[in-house]
């Protein structure tokens, strides 16, 4: 193909091609794909322009125009079986050279939902109308297509090529020709910027001349992120023109000399470059272009400049300016992350503490650790927390489930845990009997005795030493099933044993109970009272008949 | 592999010329910036110029500035510096270096030692 | 031109231990796109000198992870975490970011 017979548009750090061709999307992938592209992606309006500007240049060249619509396909596609996703911008639909997914779109109309088939996007245009740049061609979703199928009003495709930098035109001036070859078969006589490792060939003369000379040069990275053909000084000058022709291809001022040669110049600010004809500012930061806090970094050999911000800023979309980095986006912390201006702090949950491996790690707090406990008697540590329990004998109490108080056992909701008499002790409880009769072996029960006109006899102190079992009880009961009263055996078993659950059901013990038939009832009214399960608070019971209770103090009735 | 293997020593008289070599393998000769450093006999090293053999460009040290110039030929993947008005100044050697993607100088010839004596 | 300065002489160092290599820049070689153009060389007694470091802190194909390179845009410091026998030689500090390119004066590594 001859020079300027492809549609080819060149800006920033890409270059797009527009192509002829009824082929389904794949076919068309793949011709892009062949030269090193992909099919274009249109990520931003200002990509959409550039899209718009190589189909106008396609269809400059298409001679009649027909009144029709045509679709040229783009890099827009939803794989078989990924669903529509309406509340995003791409609706589901992915790139096809990968990269993220970006805010923008211009969707033809409302998709409809179908998974069950590949979906690619095309770009709608208007055949018969020239396109316009402030109308940008919507995007058509329909079926991919295949070999020899196109689909409906598919007219072409659009390429995309990227590369790392590009070279501004060579400058001629004098008269000749440049072509440009870039990196993906294409030639061109008029790109505004030409893309890295392209060839150009100059050639210089009327062209109807013998006198004609030719150079060729590369666009090469000549230094980091600087971008030259490595010409030296205007091309093709000629004495007959000077500075008339193209300014003399300098990029600001032409200086002729007597002799009809001429050297370009640079306005006041700016410094002429190695290649004798481009000019760049001499310090591109001395107009104060940053700001927020922003450092001006000048570019290389003075061309061009970067906002720089510091640690913990980042620039927002002028370039220009610092704003902060929210840094708990990437979750940075082991926990909880509290964003500052410029940085962040890492914080831990109740119960733990900053520590162990990596940055913001956060390590659990030992809250029973010699001298923090905060139980009044068991203390079990727990990963970010604890929790207290009680030895036999006790409940949690208090607002915070730290404190143990005394279960009464003789007022226990399971009933009577002696035949007779009970005595509540500080974490356990005795039993008695009443006058004329003596506390059996196993501590429960009363066995005839001598007639005694005394107080209710109970274990012999010195026989019965006030012993705790030693083992704790999980915070929600209130006694271990398996007590016995204070110095029972423990091989010894009890005749009854009480039911100590906390929804067992409070009965009610008739008085007969407490004492053997043929008791003698030579004793006074003890004081009756039960719990109810629920709050454990003691009650008066009324006239309702329990077990008679009577303190370790001697005293009897309630406490 | 990679590889720059550079002409012999050279013995000149001052005010001649020379021209030494450096013969590239393993890699793709033309799209490769090609150094040439010189390192003087118990000092340190210095950028004298380079050439990108895929158009014949070349930059030059202002610091030697006329002193040198440098070709390639893409056909036999040589490189090659032509030294001119010798001076005992330039009795040094000299090592061709492949510029990388990086900007790294990433291989070295063995070096061409110039000794300039009359 | 892009001046850089080197102490020609290490503190001499035991094998086996840590040396430190310092080098500073007249100018930034912080470029806007985020890269330092800084680069350490090594050139061992009569041989051609080789490539280490590039671009600040990356490792250069088979040279061992003893070495590390940190700094700023204008300090910068090699470290050789366990030094050898084979480490000894003169490392150079050296720019591409702007021609021409430019090299340290050296800086001499000695074993005790």
């Known amino acids: 193909t001859g020079a300027d017979t492809e549609a080819v548009v060149c800006a920033g750090t890409a270059c797009y091609t527009a192509h002829w061709g009824k082929l389904s999307a794949a076919e068309a992938q793949n011709l892009c794909l062949q030269n090193g592209g992909n099919l274009a992606t249109v990520k931003s309006e200002e990509e959409a322009q550039h899209v718009q500007q190589v189909l106008a240049q396609l269809l400059r060249r298409e001679a009649a125009l027909t009144a029709r619509m045509g679709k040229f396909w783009i890099g827009l596609q939803r794989e078989k079986g990924k669903c529509l996703d309406p509340s995003l911008p791409l609706k589901g639909f992915s790139w096809v050279g990968g990269g993220e997914d970006t805010p923008y779109s211009n969707w033809h109309k409302e998709l409809r939902n179908s998974c069950i088939s590949k979906r690619c996007v095309s770009l709608l245009l208007d055949l018969s109308q020239p396109l316009l740049p402030g109308r940008l061609p919507k995007w058509s979703e329909g079926p991919c297509g295949s070999p020899g199928s196109p689909g409906s009003n598919i007219e072409g495709f659009v390429c995309k090529f990227s590369f790392k930098g590009m070279c501004r035109p060579l400058a001629l001036g004098g008269p000749g020709q440049v072509t440009y070859t870039t990196p993906f078969q294409t030639t061109s006589s008029s790109l505004e910027a030409v893309p890295f490792a392209s060839a150009a060939n100059v050639a210089c003369g009327e062209g109807d001349k013998d006198d004609s000379q030719s150079h060729y040069f590369l666009c090469k990275e000549k230094a980091p992120d600087v971008f030259d053909w490595g010409s030296s000084g205007p091309l093709c000058v000629s004495p007959k023109y000077g500075c008339n022709f193209n300014n003399g291809g300098c990029h600001q001022d032409c200086f002729e000399g007597g002799d009809g040669s001429f050297l370009c110049g640079c306005r006041p600010g700016f410094r002429l470059l190695d290649d004798l004809v481009t000019c760049a500012s001499r310090n591109p930061c001395s107009s104060s272009p940053c700001r927020g806090g922003a450092t001006c970094i000048p570019g290389p050999h003075g061309k061009n400049y970067t906002c720089r911000c510091p640690q913990g800023y980042q620039l927002d979309s002028s370039q220009l300016d610092c704003v902060d980095v929210d840094e708990c986006q990437d979750s940075p912390c082991a926990q909880e992350c509290v964003n500052t201006p410029g940085s962040f702090r890492c914080e831990c949950w109740v119960g733990y503490e900053p520590g162990g491996p990596g940055e913001g790690a956060c390590q659990d707090v030992d809250e029973c650790a010699l001298g923090r406990s905060p139980c009044a008697q068991g203390c079990t540590n727990t990963e970010g927390s604890f929790h207290c329990s009680c030895e036999e004998g006790y409940v949690l109490a208090g607002e915070d489930g730290t404190q143990c108080q005394d279960v009464d056992e003789c007022v226990g909701p399971g009933g009577p845990l002696c035949d007779s008499l009970c005595f509540n002790t500080q974490g356990s409880f005795r039993c008695g009997c009443l006058p004329g009769w003596v506390l059996a072996p196993n501590g429960v029960s009363c066995a005839m005795g001598p007639v005694s006109l005394g107080p209710p006899s109970g274990p012999p102190d010195e026989e019965y030493k006030g012993e705790r079992e030693g083992s704790t009880v999980p915070p929600a009961a209130t006694a271990s099933p398996t007590r016995g009263p204070e110095g029972t055996p423990k091989s010894t078993p009890t005749t009854r044993r009480p039911l100590l659950s906390s929804d067992a059901p409070i009965t009610s013990v008739p008085l007969e109970v407490l004492a053997p038939s043929g008791s003698p009832g030579l004793w006074r009214e003890p004081s009756i009272h039960h719990t109810t399960a629920a709050s454990g608070a003691q009650e008066p019971a009324g006239g309702d008949s329990s077990v008679a209770t009577q303190n370790d103090d001697g005293t009897d009735g309630q406490k | 592999q990679v590889q720059l293997q550079q002409s012999g020593p050279e013995l000149v008289k001052p005010g001649a010329s020379v021209k030494i070599s450096c013969k590239a393998s393993g890699y793709a000769f033309s799209s490769y910036w090609l150094n040439w450093v010189k390192q003087r006999p118990g000092k340190g090293l210095e950028w004298f110029g380079r050439?990108?053999?895929?158009?014949?460009?070349?930059d030059y040290n202002g610091k030697f500035k006329g002193k040198a110039t440098l070709t390639a030929d893409k056909s036999s993947s040589t490189a090659y510096m032509q030294l001119r008005s010798l001076t005992s100044e330039d009795s040094a050697v000299y090592f061709c270096v492949r510029g990388d993607g990086y900007w790294a100088m990433d291989y070295w010839g063995q070096g061409t030692s110039v000794t300039v004596s009359s | 031109d892009i001046v850089m300065t080197q102490a020609a002489f290490s503190n001499p160092v035991t094998l086996g231990t840590s040396a430190s290599i310092s080098c500073r820049f007249s100018k930034s070689l912080l470029h806007s796109n985020g890269i330092t153009y800084l680069y350490w060389y090594l050139q061992k007694p009569g041989q051609s000198p080789q490539l280490l470091i590039y671009?600040?802190?990356n490792l250069a194909s088979g040279v061992p992870d003893r070495f590390s390179s940190s700094g700023s845009g204008t300090d910068f410091t090699l470290r050789i975490s366990r030094v050898e026998a084979e480490d000894v030689g003169v490392y150079y500090c050296a720019q591409n970011l702007e021609l021409p390119w430019t090299f340290g004066g050296g800086t001499k590594l000695e074993i005790k």
């Open positions: 671009q600040m802190s």
């Open positions: 050439i990108y053999p895929g158009d014949g460009d070349t």
